[in-house]
């Protein structure tokens, strides 16, 4: 999906009042300082291509955070502010559902949420220059 | 202050159809997403569908139901259910908000899917 006509503003809006809110509540018990923040994005359409990524991607040592409530959120603004976004996602939760019997939190999938947070951290400061 | 009223809601058989109807009035400039949540007995709140310029529906749902609003006014939101399955009996919600919609409520409407 290409998400150069996505209301950004309108997604930073939703991060900040609620998404935010779900992924500090994941994160919880863990020090800020935990994780080194190795993924980057480079302007507003490439980050939310990470975050999509790193949300709804299965990674090694971290199966599923698409059952996440930050996750089922992300995907709602995603889909909101972004038009055509929802026509674009496969049936990839009922999948997942079937895959995963618990939830298991893991120190890779806290790892992958750290550096989540370091994409919208990033994708809400559009203008500044990558380091 | 904003205030969300559903209707529609009703007693339906397998495979027939409802249209909710969800009328905003008040401070209707911050409603700029609004959304269609269901609740059914002993079960999580889940957002069923939502629309700002573009849409989203939940993976159970997808196909079947239908949302929109009133462009014109920006003051109504519909939600077509087609193909019901008794799974969807539930209280339906209507709910806004600036960029997520989950800052406004309405009271709910009752949907009963059932032979």
């Known amino acids: 999906y290409d998400f150069t006509n996505c209301d950004f503003e309108k997604i930073k809006a939703a991060y900040l009042s609620t998404i935010s809110k779900d992924l500090i509540t994941y994160m919880s018990g863990t020090k800020s300082t935990e994780f080194n923040n190795t993924v980057s994005c480079s302007n507003r359409p490439h980050c939310l291509t990470e975050i999509q990524s790193l949300t709804f991607n299965p990674t090694a040592g971290c199966a599923s955070l698409a059952k996440e409530m930050f996750a089922m959120k992300t995907k709602a603004a995603l889909a909101i502010w972004c038009p055509g976004y929802s026509e674009t996602q496969i049936n990839a939760t009922q999948a997942m559902k079937k895959r995963r019997k618990r939830k298991v939190t893991t120190n890779k999938c806290l790892e992958q949420v750290s550096q989540l947070q370091g994409l919208w951290r990033r994708f809400n400061r559009p203008l500044l220059k990558q380091q | 202050q904003l205030q969300l009223v559903e209707s529609g809601g009703g007693l339906v058989q397998p495979g027939g159809s409802l249209r909710l109807s969800c009328a905003a009035s008040?401070?209707?400039?911050?409603?700029?997403?609004m959304g269609w949540y269901r609740q059914a007995p002993g079960k999580e709140r889940e957002l069923v569908a939502a629309i700002g310029s573009g849409t989203y529906y939940a993976d159970s749902v997808k196909g079947r139901f239908t949302i929109s609003r009133d462009n014109a006014k920006k003051n109504t939101l519909y939600l077509q259910m087609d193909s019901l399955k008794p799974e969807d009996t539930a209280i339906y919600y209507c709910?806004?908000?600036?960029?997520?919609?989950?800052?406004?409520w309405g009271q709910g409407t009752q949907v009963t899917v059932s032979a």
């Open positions: 709910a806004s908000g600036d960029s997520y919609p989950d800052e406004y």
């Open positions: 008040g401070s209707i400039f911050s409603i700029d997403a």
